[in-house]
């Protein structure tokens, strides 16, 4: 049961992380808490990739619920062997984990690109522009240049904070799904052969 317990632990963590990803992505649509920029299409192109909503969010809920379900005691066996069914379930969880890896990977890549390019903002010339796109992410180290964006208010801070959160959350999701790949492979091969004393406490 130890592999199932660990999977359940990972599953619950992923649900929380997925919800945080969705929330962070939604906030990107409302710079400074305002709706006008979304309606005027004055948002960074990478906001429209739905990396936190789809990649780190909805796509992550599928493996999360699969992992949570692995600890159920009424797991059906195959050919009358209950353990065989549990092994199959553990191995199938590897597929779910790979979906999670794809989703979290997408979230991480888009967040990194969003950070590197910087926000779409009304620049010092009065033009809606990717003011920091040519800096190759160097603007992140030079906060004195952030005032080049005159609108939305605090847009650089907003974008940097939320894309960084998405990057971190996606990274954690990626690691957890990777752990579950290993856990699932071990659980599938070894079966539920570990003793009752070897249970994970999560």
């Amino acid at each position: 049961m130890c592999y199932g317990k660990c999977a359940r632990c990972i599953g619950h963590s992923l649900v929380g992380l997925a919800l945080l990803c969705i929330a962070a992505n939604i906030l990107l649509y409302f710079p400074n808490g305002e709706t006008k920029y979304a309606s005027e299409n004055h948002l960074s192109r990478f906001v429209w990739f739905f990396s936190g909503i789809v990649g780190g969010g909805l796509l992550m809920l599928l493996p999360a619920f699969v992992f949570i379900g692995l600890e159920q005691d009424d797991c059906c066996g195959c050919c009358g062997h209950e353990n065989c069914g549990k092994r199959c379930a553990m191995l199938s969880s590897v597929l779910a984990a790979l979906i999670g890896i794809a989703g979290s990977g997408y979230c991480v890549i888009v967040a990194a690109l969003g950070l590197a390019e910087g926000p779409l903002c009304l620049d010092s010339l009065g033009q809606w522009n990717y003011t920091f796109a040519s800096t190759e992410g160097q603007y992140l180290l030079d906060t004195s240049t952030w005032s080049e964006c005159t609108e939305p208010k605090h847009i650089v801070e907003w974008n940097v904070s939320l894309f960084s959160i998405l990057l971190a959350l996606g990274g954690i999701e990626f690691i957890l799904c990777l752990i579950q790949v290993i856990n699932g492979v071990l659980g599938g091969i070894c079966g539920f052969c570990c003793s009752h004393q070897q249970q994970y406490d999560c």
């Epitope: 009065g126 033009q127 609108e151 939305p152």
Partner: antibody, heavy 120, light 106 residues
């Protein structure tokens, strides 16, 4: 009618400060920026900077940084430009101008101008 | 900063004649605006984005050009057109104006 009405002429001593006001009417104040341009007697036009009236974020020309402050009061649709440490070469007519954002950026509505004379 | 050089500094013409004003940029720019200023008055926008006529401006005014060379043309001068004309660039900060071309009655 769309218009910008500026405060009256000022006479200041070198080292003093001047604050020029610019009241907008006939349009939504926060939909446009306000730029400040000055013109010394018999000379051309010089851009001083501009302020985003929606966010209050100003952008100053390098020549005026540290000496100029641009602010707005959205409740009265008024923009302000304060110039400190005045010198005799700051004697000029100061214009506030409505600034259209976008791919084509232009100054379509000008205030009547405020003459600031710096003399000891 | 991008320096704009206007030529000629003074243009002496008669009403009804065609006026061609030049504005040359130190380096390539996207667009320019043209303004007209009469003595004791604030400048007035004539042309924006190189070739677009501002609201309320007569069709005898037209703008053209690209890169470094831009032109304002007044097809047939009216008495009220005698004034100083400025070009202005907005491709980079600081925004700069040309030195002006004075169109005077010959």
């Amino acid at each position: 009618e769309v218009q910008l009405v500026q405060s009256g002429a000022e006479v200041k001593k070198p080292g003093a400060s001047v604050k020029v006001s610019c009241k907008a009417s006939g349009y939504t104040f926060t939909n446009y920026g306000v730029k400040w341009v000055r013109q010394a007697p018999g000379q051309g036009l010089e851009w001083m900077g501009w302020i985003n009236t929606y966010t209050g974020n100003p952008i100053y020309a390098a020549d005026f940084k540290g000496r100029v402050t641009m602010t707005t009061d959205t409740s009265t649709s008024t923009a302000y430009m304060e110039l400190r440490s005045l010198r005799s070469d700051d004697t000029a007519v100061y214009y506030c101008v409505r600034f259209q954002y976008g791919d084509y950026r232009y100054f379509d509505v000008w205030g009547q101008g405020t003459l600031v004379t710096v003399s000891s | 900063e991008i320096v704009l050089t206007q030529s000629p500094a003074t243009l002496s013409l008669s009403p009804g004649e065609r006026a061609t004003l030049s504005c040359r940029a130190q380096s390539g720019i996207s667009f320019i605006n043209w303004y007209q200023q009469k003595p004791g008055q604030a400048p007035r926008l004539l042309i924006y984005g190189t070739a677009n006529l501002a609201s309320g401006i007569p069709a005898r005014f037209s703008g053209s050009g690209s890169g470094r060379d831009f032109t304002l043309t007044i097809s047939s001068l009216e008495p009220e057109d005698f004034a100083v004309y400025y070009c202005q660039q907005y491709s980079s900060n600081p925004l700069t104006f040309g030195g002006g071309t004075k169109v005077e009655i010959k």
